[in-house]
C-alpha cells in the first residue's frame, strides 16, 4: 500500500532543488532564488542561511544545500552548524563576562577558546615535576624520585620557567 501511494503521489517525484507546487497542480517547480530543498518530495523550499556580521560564508547556498557559515578572524564557532560566534582570547586567558582574563595561578589554557584548567598534580601519580606550569602550558611530570636511585641514569630537569609566582606547589 505504501509503495502504491508513493507511486500515486506526484510530490514524491520532485527531486532536491525543487518543490511540489500546490499552486501549479503539484508540478515540481524550481526553488525560488536564495532558497533550497535538500531532499526530494518537499512541499516548500527553505530560505538560505545568510552569513552576516561576525559570521562569514564558508560554503555558498545552492538550490540543493544550505549555506554554511564560520566566524570572522578573532572569533570561533559554537553550537551545531556554527550557530554562534564567540570571541577568541589569547593562550593563557579565558573568556569571562568582562572579557578576556588571564588564567589564575595554578591553571592554564593552551588554546584561544575554552576555560583555564588546573595544572596536573604530578604527585598524585607518584611523579615529580619535570617542567613548571605556566598560564599557557601544563606542568610536565617526570619520573618519581624513587626512580632516580643511585645507578639509574639521572635526568637533569630544565631550568624552571622564568615567571614569578608560577612554580608548582
Amino acid at each position: 500500500f505504501e509503495r502504491t501511494r508513493s507511486l500515486q503521489d506526484p510530490c514524491s517525484n520532485c527531486p532536491a532543488g525543487t518543490f511540489c507546487d500546490n499552486n501549479r497542480n503539484q508540478i515540481c517547480s524550481p526553488c525560488p532564488p536564495n532558497s533550497f530543498s535538500s531532499a526530494g518530495g518537499q512541499r516548500t523550499c527553505d530560505i538560505c542561511r545568510q552569513c552576516k556580521g561576525v559570521f562569514r560564508t564558508r560554503k555558498e547556498c545552492s538550490s540543493t544545500s544550505n549555506a554554511e557559515c564560520d566566524c570572522t578572524p578573532g572569533f570561533h564557532c559554537l553550537g551545531a552548524g556554527c550557530s554562534m560566534c564567540e570571541q577568541d582570547c589569547k593562550q593563557g586567558q579565558e573568556l569571562t563576562k568582562k572579557g578576556c582574563k588571564d588564567c589564575c595561578f595554578g591553571t592554564f589554557n593552551d588554546q584561544k577558546r575554552g576555560i583555564c584548567r588546573p595544572w596536573t598534580n604530578c604527585s598524585l601519580d607518584g611523579k615529580s615535576v619535570l617542567v613548571n606550569g605556566t598560564k599557557e602550558r601544563d606542568v610536565v611530570c617526570g619520573p618519581s624520585p624513587a626512580d632516580l636511585s643511585p645507578g639509574a641514569s639521572s635526568v637533569t630537569p630544565p631550568a624552571p620557567a622564568r615567571e614569578p609566582g608560577h612554580s608548582p606547589q
Epitope: G17, P30, P32, P33, C61, S62, T64
Partner: nanobody, 126 residues
C-alpha cells in the same frame, strides 16, 4: 510580452537521440530558472529537469543519465539533448521559465510568475 517557443520534436526509433530547443523572447524578461516538462497521452504534466537560480541542473530520476539540459545565453535558448530514447518518453515537451515579480530576490517568494511554451511532440516508436 514573454514568449517561449519549442522546436525539434518528431518521430524517432527507440534508442535514437533528439535535441529540443526553446527560444525565449520578450522585453526586460529576467528568469531565475528554466525547465523542461512533458505530458504523455492521458497523463498529468511531469517534471523533466531544470536549471536553478544558482545554475545547478537537476533531472527527474526517469531521465537522469540520458537527458542533458544546456543553454546558450547569447541566443536566449535552452536545449534538451535526449539520448537512448524509450517508448515511454513519448510526450509533448514543454519549456518553462520562472521569474519573481519586481526582481524580489531577497525574500522567499512563492508568488512566482511562470511562462510556458506551446510544446513540441516527441514520439518514440519501438
Amino acid at each position: 510580452e514573454v514568449q517561449l517557443v519549442e522546436s525539434g520534436g518528431g518521430l524517432v526509433q527507440a534508442g535514437a537521440s533528439l535535441t529540443l530547443s526553446c527560444v525565449i523572447s520578450g522585453r526586460t524578461f529576467s528568469s531565475y530558472a528554466m525547465g523542461w516538462y512533458r505530458q504523455a497521452p492521458g497523463k498529468e504534466r511531469a517534471f523533466v529537469g531544470t536549471i536553478t537560480w544558482n545554475n545547478d541542473i537537476i533531472y527527474s530520476d526517469s531521465v537522469k543519465g540520458r537527458f542533458t539540459i544546456s543553454t546558450d545565453d547569447g541566443k536566449n535558448t535552452m536545449y534538451l539533448q535526449m539520448n537512448n530514447l524509450k517508448p515511454e518518453d513519448t510526450a509533448v515537451y514543454y519549456c518553462a521559465a520562472y521569474s519573481v515579480p519586481y526582481g524580489d530576490f531577497c525574500t522567499l517568494n512563492y508568488d512566482l510568475m511562470d511562462y510556458w511554451g506551446k510544446g513540441t511532440l516527441v514520439t518514440v516508436s519501438s
